[in-house]
């Protein structure tokens, strides 16, 4: 089931899925100027059985202005680089990715990509937070958030995690004031 | 408690546009998506697409893609979407729905009548 | 995209039936919603995840299945109950809805 919802916007973080559960879907964007293939796919599907899963499906991007098909290149280590998405780039990894059945790596990057990555998360994904270069954590409990299902409505729980300016005097971690969870409704509340 | 209100049925000629709003009410505007689904007369329903309204981001049926162009207004929570190029078969009743899950709300619906 | 597929299309039955309409995806999903309408009116939801029943939703209604078969019951059908009732997955994009299922008086 998809999630109708977004991960909690945490100040100073940026989040990332080590994995990606099936069902997930990455919408096929391409950059400024190119355009998917005629007939190419909408999406990337995360699909699978018990032993093995992977994407379905390749995005294709094509010059805007021609009418010549791209191929599907990995781009060179600097084009990398430059890729900005709304993951987070440092390398952490509280999941081995190949390690989780059931679930899908990160899919390599396609020629002419947009920059964002836009994903379509499924109940049950779960998501890391890491503060942005020149901050600091404060935990009060795990950095991640789950898309959880109540009543037939998605939300995804709040991670307790605070980032701070390395330079800043900040509160204990106890002493915070708790953050509302998201969409304001419950927390705790995962079945009916 | 939780409405949706759609503005009124509109008459348009072919080859013209329209734009629908929808204002919500009773809930925070920026934490649900709002979804739009179309009823041609007589017929079934058919998902067009969704705004997330903090971000703006939107998501259409493919179907739709040329067809429709929702937005959303944080300040007076509404979401609009206009459909272009009008023609006969876009005569249909016009729902925005609240999304963040199943469509547990939805607004009267809107008929548009594209006639020349 | 994922056809729904309902049965039959049109169910003609009487006060105090038990009812039973059919959904068929083309594909694998995690659950079927349903929702009934009325002429002229929206659309109302009225059991999600495939068997939970919406607030205020009279028990006669149930909902079962898994995969790609679903069925919507009604028990014992009421006067209240002769609407157009619609299956919906939202497992995957876009989300679809079945062709809808109306039942009117026999």
């Known amino acids: 089931e998809l999630c109708d919802d977004d991960p909690p916007e945490i100040p100073h973080a940026t989040f990332k899925a080590m994995a990606y559960k099936e069902g997930t879907m990455l919408n096929c964007e391409c950059k400024r100027g190119f355009r998917r293939i005629k007939s190419g796919s909408l999406y990337m599907l995360c699909t699978g059985n018990s032993s093995h899963s992977s994407w379905d499906n390749q995005c294709q991007c094509t010059s805007s202005a021609t009418r010549n098909t791209t191929k599907q290149v990995t781009p060179q280590p600097e084009e990398q680089k430059e890729r900005k998405t709304t993951e987070m780039q440092s390398p952490m990894q509280p999941v081995d990715q190949a390690s989780l059945p059931g679930h899908c790596r990160e899919p390599p990057p396609w020629e002419n990509e947009a920059t964002e990555r836009i994903y379509h998360f499924v109940v049950g994904q779960m998501v890391y937070y890491q503060c942005v270069q020149g901050y600091r954590a404060l935990h009060r409990g795990p950095a991640e958030s789950v898309c959880k299902m109540t009543h037939g409505k998605t939300r995804w729980t709040q991670p307790q995690l605070i980032c701070t300016g390395e330079m800043e005097t900040s509160q204990f971690p106890g002493e915070e004031k708790p953050q509302a969870s998201p969409e304001g409704r419950p927390e705790s509340e995962t079945s009916c | 408690q939780v409405q949706l209100v759609q503005s009124g049925a509109e008459v348009k000629k072919p080859g013209s546009s329209v734009k629908v709003s929808c204002k919500a009410s009773?809930?925070?505007?920026?934490?649900?998506?709002m979804h739009w689904v179309r009823q041609a007369p007589g017929q079934g329903l058919e998902w067009i697409g969704y705004?997330?309204?903090?971000?703006?981001?939107?998501q259409y049926n493919q179907k739709f893609k040329d067809k429709a162009t929702i937005t959303a207004d944080e300040s007076t929570n509404t979401a609009y979407m206009e459909l272009s190029s009008l023609r006969s078969e876009d005569t249909a009743v016009y729902y925005c729905?609240?999304?963040?899950?199943?469509?547990?709300?939805w607004g009267q619906g809107t008929l548009v009548t594209v006639s020349s | 995209d994922i056809q729904m597929t309902q049965s039959p299309s049109t169910l003609s039955a009487s006060v105090g039936d038990r009812v039973t309409i059919t959904c068929s995806a083309s594909?694998?999903?995690?659950?079927m919603h349903w929702y009934q309408q009325k002429p002229g009116k929206a659309p109302k939801l009225l059991i999600y995840?495939?068997?939970n029943l919406a607030s205020g939703v009279p028990a006669r209604f149930s909902g079962s299945g898994s995969g790609t078969e679903f069925t919507l019951t009604i028990s014992s059908l009421q006067p209240d109950d002769f609407a157009t009732y619609y299956c919906?997955?939202?497992?995957?994009?876009?989300?679809?809805f079945g062709q809808g299922t109306k039942v009117e008086v026999k």
């Open positions: 995840t495939t068997s």
């Open positions: 705004i997330r309204p903090k971000r703006g981001y939107t």
């Open positions: 594909s694998s999903i995690s659950y």
């Open positions: 729905a609240r999304g963040g899950g199943v469509f547990d709300y």
């Open positions: 919906h997955q939202r497992s995957t994009y876009p989300l679809t």
């Open positions: 009773g809930y925070t505007f920026t934490s649900y998506r």
